[in-house]
Interface confidence: medium
């Protein structure tokens, strides 16, 4: 029962992670206008995403525009787009694998095969979490680097946007959920639930430690 409960928790976490990842990828809030001191550096608020950017005028009117050319986009933006889409597709594949091996499905009858499918789905979710983490951390690094670069004009300085925080959350949930699914699977048929719990308790801190390693505050 504990194993089934952990499986359900793992899948719920990965589903939440996937939704977070989707919203993070779609929202044009990866980079936002920097505030320096008490005043905003430009008259408008600028939001930049992977697919479009938006300018919010002081009047409250918002104008969004999709990036013009696919070919001329900077390589970091193209890479972030690709990784985001791949991460979402990988997570979907992980979900399909999980459903094939879930306790409550009849796709696969044999217990060992089910366990292997659940373990595989857990690994796939962990991979998805890492793929989500790469563009988010890379973009955050670029924002922080530009913030302190004297040859980046003030109008181009940006701060970390809500999409990045959602991305970190998505990655954390996918890693945690995937980790839980990996932990619910016995390495052999003879071990009981206590074995899964023991494995879970030792690996959980290692998984939960991940997202907090990234500095998100000390950049202003």
């Amino acid at each position: 029962m504990a194993s089934a409960g952990m499986q359900i928790l793992g899948v719920v976490l990965t589903l939440l992670g996937w939704v977070n990842g989707l919203v993070s990828c779609a929202l044009p809030m990866w980079k936002v206008t920097a505030f320096i001191g008490n005043s905003i550096v430009v008259a408008q608020v600028v939001w930049e995403g992977l697919w479009m950017s938006c300018v919010v005028q002081s009047t409250g009117q918002m104008q969004c525009k999709v990036y013009d050319s696919l070919l001329a986009l900077p390589q970091d933006l193209q890479a972030a787009r690709a990784l985001c889409v791949i991460a979402l597709l990988v997570a979907l594949f992980g979900l399909l694998v999980y459903l094939a091996g879930a306790k409550c499905t009849t796709c696969v009858e044999e217990k060992d095969s089910k366990a292997r499918l659940v373990l595989t789905s857990g690994i796939v979710f962990v991979i998805s979490g890492v793929l989500t983490l790469i563009p988010v951390c890379w973009t955050a690094h670029a924002i922080i680097r530009d913030f302190y670069n004297p040859l980046v004009a003030e109008a181009q300085k940006r701060e970390l946007g809500a999409s990045l925080y959602l991305g970190w959350a998505a990655s954390g949930l996918l890693l945690l959920g995937g980790g839980l699914l990996c932990c619910t699977c016995p390495s052999g048929g003879s071990q009981g639930p206590s074995h899964y719990m023991a494995r879970y308790s030792t690996s959980a801190p290692a998984i939960s430690r991940g997202p907090s390693e990234y500095p998100t505050k000390n950049y202003v």
């Epitope: 990036y67 050319s69 986009l73 040859l151 004009a153």
Partner: antibody
Framework: QVQLVQSGAEVKKPGASVKVSCKAS????????IEWVRQAPGQGLEWMGL????????NYNEKFKGRVTMTTDTSTSTAYMELRSLRSDDTAVYYC???????????????????WGQGTLVTVSS | EIVLTQSPDFQSVTPKEKVTITCSVS???????LHWYQQKPDQSPKLWIY???NLASGVPSRFSGSGSGTDFTLTINSLEAEDAATYYC?????????FGGGTKVEIK
């Protein structure tokens, strides 16, 4: 509208210095980089360097290092380019330009308009 | 430094003809860092195409840009008299932001 107005033509002797000014208007001066480009008579464009008026940060073309100094006066929204130890091959039109936003993705969604000054002819002759 | 080599140096073309100017870069750069300028006699240069393929404001649609890595192209599909000018490519990939030698387009 955005305007960059440069100082008038100069005639200098070899070994002297020249200081070209570039007065900006129509935008927030500290928000954009200013680059300097020169063009010898009948020749192509040559990038000299840039300055960030907001921070004073500069990057010079190695060819001019030690001879060129770029500065700004934010109170008057004016950029300056001083070239020392002038030689006859420094005879050229010197342009200042306000560069399109770089270092951020928004550049790829909005027109990459670069504004240029009208140019300042500096003649170096003995 | 990155060296940009333009070809041809000079092109004499009849109106309505297609013009192709190439810019060869000494080391591979991102397409977002390659720009084209138009300059007419006794005028300041004008940004013409930015990020390889994006037309700047007011540039007619007969102009186009393409390329990647080390080879970039500016194309005028049907030359008009007002297009007579010198065209320069420039890279913003690394300092110094070097220019190509220029291609002068003349109307026959």
């Amino acid at each position: 509208q955005v305007q960059l107005v440069q100082s008038g033509a100069e005639v200098k002797k070899p070994g002297a210095s020249v200081k070209v000014s570039c007065k900006a208007s129509g935008y927030t001066f500290t928000n954009y980089l200013i680059e300097w480009v020169r063009q010898a008579p009948g020749q192509g464009l040559e990038w000299m360097g840039l300055i960030n008026p907001g921070s004073g940060g500069t990057n010079y073309n190695e060819k001019f290092k030690g001879r060129v100094t770029m500065t700004t006066d934010t109170s008057t929204s004016t950029a300056y380019m001083e070239l020392r130890s002038l030689r006859s091959d420094d005879t050229a039109v010197y342009y200042c330009a306000r560069r399109s936003p770089l270092g951020s993705w928004i550049y790829y969604a909005y027109d990459g308009v670069a504004y240029w000054g009208q140019g300042t002819l500096v003649t170096v002759s003995s | 430094e990155i060296v940009l080599t333009q070809s041809p140096d000079f092109q004499s073309v009849t109106p309505k003809e297609k013009v192709t100017i190439t810019c060869s870069v000494s080391s591979s750069i991102s397409s977002s860092n390659l720009h084209w300028y138009q300059q007419k006699p006794d005028q300041s240069p004008k940004l013409w195409i930015y990020g390889t393929s994006n037309l700047a404001s007011g540039v007619p649609s007969r102009f186009s840009g393409s390329g990647s890595g080390t080879d970039f192209t500016l194309t005028i599909n049907s030359l008009e008299a007002e297009d007579a000018a010198t065209y320069y490519c420039q890279q913003w990939s690394s300092y110094p932001h070097t220019f190509g030698g220029g291609t002068k387009v003349e109307i026959k």
